[in-house]
């Protein structure tokens, strides 16, 4: 058993049929010695008396808010949550496996630049009685600070018969160093509590590996005289790291016909302009990627050819 | 800023070669990008590589003050990786494919380090750790880790040279 926060405790249980469970001793936080009784949740049934209560925790029915009283007055509370371990593996019932970029990916994180700011998100089908708490650091043995905000519900989607809820959190490294080569990964830890079930999820990454620039901005076309060619120009996204002479991007320019089956013409360039042939009813799209490190491409910025 | 005993590098040449190094480092093992090698334990094997740290002067302001400080660290790293790529980690079994970019990568590391250290100058270089994995699978894992680390190192070096070529070239 360990303390998650004040008056909230997590009992770690091996979860199998007829498992013996864990013996837990609760102590009433009071100077009083006599006349103390214990109850669980809203029930008025007295579970025991005395300053301590010893219980055998085996299942969710044994978890909940234990309260010690004296003469009708509440003295203190202890909330017991369960963390299940099945076949040596901690349960992952609360969050959905996003399966990208690999199986057992529950947390996904992205950064728009090298400033040390990043966003993580996760999915669940659970809509109520759900709380999340997020902690992060750079490295684990001698951790350096990363500050995370509160996790918020950021999207709701209908998937078949189910509703899916996306939660996200923003974090910022306290002493970020955009120009350095990272040697210690960022660690993100999410505590999830659904009713009386506790689970924790972790992710470890370098900012450089989760970079995904915003799409290029101000995408414009300029027809070239007496030609089917156009000059496409664009700018670095506002959110990208500066100076751009140091934090450079590379770009992919694509000409795509109306039909998905039509052949796509692609040009790669380090410049912020390119000359392409604009076909009727086609569109021109540009996306960006870090020039020197193969992290994710941005989403496309697009304009119609006409 | 004039540097006693140090001269300005050929920024544009360094930029071109470092960008080529980036391309080669990713083509040497593109899949490396999708493997989470941190899960494989064995951290100490690549812990000794010289990283370009926050205080090394490789940020735009540090480069403007005196680029030699950053260039020393980059040179140290290039020599380190050049030695690793020439060691039995890469030359031993399992053999690299004949068209593997590792050979080109090795030569380009040497080429860039020579651009930074003209003939006659001999800078102290970091000792490479004695890594001699006994099993071919260990060697393979170590190759992936070294290439992964090299990708990060050359990305920072390429940024430095691109910025130098754009802002510090005479």
């Amino acid at each position: 058993i360990w303390e998650l926060k004040k008056d909230v405790y997590v009992v770690e249980l091996d979860w199998y049929p007829d498992a013996p469970g864990e013996m837990v001793v609760l102590t009433c936080d009071t100077p009083e010695e006599d006349g103390i009784t214990w109850t669980l949740d809203q029930s008025s049934e007295v579970l025991g008396s005395g300053k301590t209560l010893t219980i055998q925790v085996k299942e969710f029915g044994d978890a909940g808010q234990y309260t010690c009283h004296k003469g009708g007055e509440v003295l203190s509370h202890s909330l017991l949550l369960l963390h299940k371990k099945e076949d040596g593996i901690w349960s992952t019932d609360i969050l959905k496996d996003q399966k990208e970029p690999k199986n057992k990916t529950f947390l996904r994180c992205e950064a728009k630049n090298y400033s040390g700011r990043f966003t993580c998100w996760w999915l669940t089908t659970i809509s109520t009685d759900l709380t999340f708490s997020v902690k992060s650091s750079r490295g684990s043995s001698d951790p350096q600070g990363v500050t995370c905000g509160a996790a918020t519900l950021s999207a709701e989607r209908v998937r078949g018969d189910n509703k899916e809820y996306e939660y996200s959190v923003e974090c910022q490294e306290d002493s970020a160093c955009p120009a350095a080569e990272e040697s210690l990964p960022i660690e993100v830890m999410v505590d999830a509590v659904h009713k009386l079930k506790y689970e924790n999820y972790t992710s470890s990454f370098f900012i450089r590996d989760i970079i995904k620039p915003d799409p290029p901005k101000n995408l414009q076309l300029k027809p070239l005289k007496n030609s089917r060619q156009v000059e496409v120009s664009w700018e670095y996204p506002d959110t990208w790291s500066t100076p751009h002479s140091y934090f450079s991007l590379t770009f992919c320019v694509q000409v795509q016909g109306k039909s998905k089956r039509e052949k796509k013409d692609r040009v790669f360039t380090d410049k912020t302009s390119a000359t392409v042939i604009c076909r009727k009813n086609a569109s021109i799209s540009v996306r960006a990627q870090d020039r020197y490190y193969s992290s994710s491409w941005s989403e496309w910025a697009s304009v119609p050819c006409s | 800023r004039a540097v006693p005993g140090g001269s300005s590098p050929a920024w544009t040449q360094c930029q071109q070669l470092s960008q080529k190094l980036c391309t080669l480092a990713w083509s040497a093992h593109p899949l490396v990008g999708h493997m989470d090698l941190r899960e494989e334990g064995d951290e100490e094997t690549t812990n000794d590589v010289p990283h370009i740290q926050c205080g090394d002067g490789c940020d735009p302001q540090g480069l403007r003050d005196n680029s030699q400080f950053c260039l020393q660290r980059i040179h140290q790293g290039l020599i380190f990786y050049e030695k690793l790529l020439g060691s039995d980690i890469f030359t031993g079994e399992p053999s690299l494919l004949p068209d593997s970019p590792v050979g080109q990568l090795h030569a380009s590391l040497l080429g860039l380090s020579q651009l930074l250290q003209p003939e006659g100058h001999h800078w102290e270089t970091q000792q490479i750790p004695s890594l001699s994995p006994s099993q071919p699978w260990q060697r393979l894992l170590l190759r992936f880790k070294i290439l992964r680390s090299l990708q990060a190192f050359v990305a920072v070096a390429a940024r430095v040279f691109a910025h130098g070529a754009a802002t510090l070239s005479p």
């Epitope: 002493s175 | 005993g5 140090g6 002067g57 940020d59 302001q61 003050d65 030699q68 020393q72 102290e124």
Partner: nanobody
Framework: EVQLVESGGGLVQAGTSLRLSCAAS????????MGWFRQAPGKEREFVAI????????DYRDSVKGRFTISRDNARNTGYLEMNSLKPEDTAVYFC?????????????????WGQGTQVTVSS
């Protein structure tokens, strides 16, 4: 954490020499750029000299160029500041420091690890 201890300060006549030492313990000294700074009474702490982690490149404030020499011995985890032709205006507490942050190479704010300082007084 890194601990730095300076020594070698003292009271000397103008025109003479002193050699300051900076002994490091804790983290790997040889990983960091090292700098010497000084602070005269009632004045800001100012940059004196700086040296790369491998000891190859150095830089100095204009007023000490040609008189002061910074060096380091990574095998001994020690840095040095050789001060020749000392002048009364060199009087200050001298600090050694290791650089851990980005920004100007000459900004004390980019150095996180500091010694307690050693007093140098140059009389005319």
């Amino acid at each position: 954490e890194v601990q730095l201890v300076e020594s070698g300060g003292g009271l000397v006549q103008a025109g003479t020499s002193l050699r300051l030492s900076c002994a490091a313990s804790g983290r790997t000294f040889s990983n960091y750029i090292m700098g010497w700074f000084r602070q005269a009474p009632g004045k800001e702490r100012e940059f004196v000299a700086i040296i790369t982690a491998n000891g190859v490149a150095t830089d100095y404030r204009d007023s000490v160029k040609g008189r002061f020499t910074i060096s380091r011995d990574n095998a001994r985890n020690t840095g040095y500041l050789e001060m020749n032709s000392l002048k009364p205006e060199d009087t200050a507490v001298y600090f050694c420091a290791l650089r851990t942050r980005s920004g100007s190479l000459f900004d004390p704010g980019t150095f996180d690890y500091w010694g307690q300082g050693t007093q140098v007084t140059v009389s005319s």
